[in-house]
Structure formats: structure tokens, C-alpha cells
Interface confidence: medium
């Protein structure tokens, strides 16, 4: 099953009746799978086999960095248990698998190149154009994204991370709404209070009035 | 104090249905989201459906889209979970858990006793 | 090889102080996802022990004593669960599981069984 149809309605609300933060988005790494045999936004943490060193960028918390390869990245719970298929297939919209092979020596070029076709060098990727934010062997570098009509671009790609973008003011996106900005809430259900504002990367925040939680 | 029970499960053989019931209370039920997890014997744990505090968004692990529906009756601070055309595979104990639905926090943190399902010819 | 890593089994004597470890897949960055620790006592439902996200962010389970603590290792993409003063009812089965802090995703090791020595 693909993982757009994880959910059977379209996320419109928070999950509980407070909402909780986005966690921040890396830069380099994949997010842990949202569907058995798929990963979210990471196009080169996609294909596990040739994803090398941590990138040390990471997106600042409640940024969306676009991806070549794009995915709902829907809330769900996924077993791993001995024996069970978590292995990431390689849904490639826009490279050949080919690209993700090893070198014969099994090196890679490291974040801000890609692997030539013909040379078998390192080439640096065009600052503005593309990026490569991990270790890799792709015969070209990612393309840079342009933000949406419904986001503020928050820093521009440079050849190690693709462009970073923001909900404009006023609305936000958190996991249930991964491909759009959503309006802020204007006030909390009954018997909340709130304790945060909204902010790009999440709706107001509200708690129960009552304040025995205990563990939060 | 925060109670789950789960009722309903049983024997049942393969390609027949049962519905799972969970009972709430100790909490106020229409603020949390719920969910269904499950346990085959001597195995993990394994995630199998969610649904948010009004019952407008619902969730579901790959292995039962299609075959199992989650729901909730919040008059009645109860959850469901509508299971057909079973398979072996789908023998475990079934939990009923909370979401914990608080600022920051996205854990299960209460869980019921269980009801056992069993698919068998 | 699967996303989380959990070892199958450790042991530590009564008193004693253990650390659980839960080793996240190289492709994934540990910081930037919340680390959840449970416990499964035999023939008992999972109970909430722990999240842990940072020093500054992380959250007890209902009546877990703090002898349960949660940290991290962002540069061995790792998490912790330590166990102080163990006691014979720490001996269970302990599921970490990671996610995001705003979503239900979570994703389950595969356990550890920790049993606790006389």
C-alpha cells in the first residue's frame, strides 16, 4: 500500500485536543518510516544503502526543507520486531536506481558534490541550483526547490541543503498536514486552556484546565 | 483513575469478524486520541489503528487497511474496533491504549488488560 | 537491518544501576526525534515509562519513579534508558520506540529483556 493512502481522512484536526509541536526536520537523514516499506522526506536517506555520514545541518525546528522525491508523511505506529520487512523501498520519481549505487571502491562524494557519470570524480553541485545533503554516488545533484505560494522562504538552498521554507504568518503545518499550511486555530476546545501561540510549525498549544497531568 | 477494558475477543475462523470494545473512564474520553495496538504471541508489539478525539481523522497500520475499521462513541466513552475477513496472522492480544494527547507529549500512556483473538480453523 | 536496535537480553544485579540502549539506523538523526521507553512486566499491557527529547524537554510516565531516567547520545544516534536501585519487579521486557513530538508516529525496537540477579 503506498503511504498516501495511510490515512483514511484528510487530517483537519489535531490528533488529541491540543496540539502538540513539529519536531525540527534534519537536513541529512530520512524520518523513520510513516508506512511498512517507506520513509518520509529524505530523498538521499531513501535509499538506506548509500547514505553515509551525518550531515551536520539540520533544518531549524518547524521548517519544511523540500525534497526532490515528496511523501505525506501520515502518524502511524510501525512495528519493528525480529524478522519484519523494514526494509525502505526506493520509490525514485526522478533518478534512475543506477544513481544510487556504490563506486567500485565503494567511497563516496561527500555532501555539496555528486558522483560524475563520466569521470567518476567528485563535482561540486551549483550553489542555488542543486545540493546533496549526505555522502553519496548520484550522477547529479538534487535540484533546488522553489518555496509554495503558501510559504516564506526562510533560507535560501545552498549546495549542501535544499531551500527551507516556512508557513506564512498566521498559518502553520505540523505532521497531520505535511504538504500544506493550515490556519491557526482561533481558541481551544472546552476545558483548555492555551499555553502557546501559534507558530509556522504549530497550532496554538492548549492544556486541560486541570493541572494534575502528572507527566508532562 | 484512568480504566481501559477491552471485551469482545474470542475465537473466530479465518475469514470471519469480530468487534473489539473498550470501555473508558476515569478521563475526560472526547479530548484523547485512541488507539488499538496488538501482540502476537510471544512477539512485539504492533501498532493497528489510531483515531483522533473526534473521530474525524482515522489511522491504520498497512497489514489491516481495508479489513479493519477504529471508531468511537464518545456519549458512550467507548472505542471500537470492527475487524474483518481475519487471517491467522492477526491471533494476538489486543490492547486499548490512550494517546496521550498533552503539549509535547505523543506517548500510549495508559494501557487496557487486553482481549485475546484468536483465528483459527 | 532494522530502523531501531534494541540487544535481545541484559542482566544486572539487585541495586545495581543499568542502562538500556536503544541504537537508532545510521540514516536517521536521533536529535531531531523524541525517544520513548516501555515496559512490558509478563502477562501484563505495556506501560509508559519515559520521553526523552532533551535535558530541557522530556516527560515521566504516570507513577514512574524518577530511578527511570531517559538520555541521549546524538553522536552515537543513540538512546538511553537508565535503571537505578534495580529492583526484582524491573524484571520485564523494555520496548524503546521514536517520534516525532507533534504525530502519533512512533516506531518499536525490538525489545530487551532485562532480568534482574539475586
Known amino acids: 500500500a503506498s503511504g498516501t493512502e495511510a490515512a483514511t481522512a484528510t487530517p483537519s484536526k489535531v490528533w488529541g485536543s491540543s496540539a502538540g509541536r513539529i519536531e525540527p526536520r534534519g537536513g541529512g537523514r530520512g524520518a523513520l518510516p510513516t508506512s511498512m516499506g517507506q520513509q518520509g522526506p529524505s530523498a538521499q536517506a531513501r535509499a538506506g544503502r548509500v547514505v553515509g555520514p551525518r550531515s551536520a545541518q539540520g533544518a531549524s525546528p518547524g521548517l519544511r526543507v523540500h525534497k526532490t522525491l515528496k511523501f505525506v508523511v501520515v502518524g502511524v505506529l510501525l512495528q519493528v520486531v525480529p524478522g519484519s520487512a523494514a526494509t525502505i523501498k526506493v520509490h525514485d520519481q526522478s533518478v534512475g536506481t543506477q544513481q544510487w549505487e556504490h563506486s567500485p571502491l565503494g567511497e563516496l562524494c561527500p555532501p555539496g558534490s555528486h558522483r560524475s557519470e563520466h569521470s567518476g570524480a567528485c563535482n561540486q553541485c551549483t550553489e542555488g541550483v542543486g545540493y546533496t545533503s549526505a555522502s553519496n554516488n548520484l550522477f547529479s545533484c538534487l535540484p533546488c526547490t522553489a518555496c509554495k505560494s503558501d510559504e516564506e522562504e526562510r533560507s535560501a538552498c545552498t549546495r549542501t541543503r535544499n531551500t527551507a521554507c516556512q508557513c506564512k504568518p498566521g498559518t502553520f503545518r505540523n505532521d497531520d498536514s505535511a504538504e500544506m499550511c493550515r490556519k491557526c486555530s482561533t481558541g481551544c476546545p472546552r476545558g483548555k486552556v492555551k499555553v502557546k501561540d501559534c507558530t509556522p510549525w504549530s497550532d496554538i498549544e492548549c492544556v486541560h484546565n486541570e493541572s494534575g497531568n502528572g507527566h508532562n | 483513575e484512568v480504566q481501559l477494558v477491552e471485551s469482545g475477543g474470542g475465537l473466530v475462523k479465518p475469514g470471519g469478524s469480530l468487534r473489539l470494545s473498550c470501555a473508558a473512564s476515569?478521563?475526560?474520553?472526547?479530548?484523547?486520541?485512541m488507539h488499538w495496538v496488538r501482540q502476537a504471541p510471544g512477539k512485539g508489539l504492533e501498532w493497528v489503528a489510531g483515531?483522533?478525539?473526534?473521530?474525524?481523522?482515522?489511522y491504520y497500520a498497512d497489514s489491516v487497511k481495508g479489513r479493519f475499521t477504529i471508531s468511537r462513541d464518545n456519549a458512550k466513552n467507548s472505542l471500537y474496533l470492527q475487524m474483518n475477513s481475519l487471517r491467522a496472522e492477526d491471533t494476538a492480544v489486543y490492547y486499548c491504549a490512550r494517546d496521550s494527547s498533552t503539549t509535547r507529549t505523543r506517548a500510549l500512556d495508559y494501557w487496557g488488560q487486553g482481549t485475546l483473538v484468536t483465528v483459527s480453523s | 537491518q532494522p530502523v531501531l536496535h534494541q540487544p535481545p537480553a541484559m542482566s544486572s544485579a539487585l541495586g545495581t544501576t543499568i542502562r538500556l540502549t536503544c541504537t537508532l539506523r545510521?540514516?536517521?538523526?536521533?536529535?531531531?526525534?523524541?525517544v520513548y521507553w516501555y515496559q512490558q512486566r509478563p502477562g501484563h499491557p505495556p506501560r509508559f515509562l519515559l520521553r526523552?527529547?532533551?535535558?530541557?524537554?522530556?516527560?515521566?510516565g504516570p507513577q514512574v519513579p524518577p530511578r527511570f531516567s531517559g538520555s541521549k547520545d546524538v553522536a552515537r544516534n543513540r538512546g538511553y534508558l537508565s535503571i537505578s536501585e534495580l529492583q526484582p519487579e524491573d524484571e520485564a521486557m523494555y520496548y524503546c520506540a521514536m517520534g516525532a513530538r507533534s504525530s502519533v508516529t512512533h516506531v518499536f525496537g525490538s525489545g530487551t529483556q532485562l532480568t534482574v540477579l539475586s
Open positions: 545510521n540514516d536517521h538523526d536521533i536529535g531531531v526525534y523524541s
Open positions: 526523552y527529547f532533551s535535558q530541557s524537554d522530556k516527560s515521566q
Open positions: 483515531i483522533n478525539y473526534s473521530g474525524n481523522n482515522k
Open positions: 476515569g478521563f475526560t474520553f472526547s479530548t484523547y486520541g
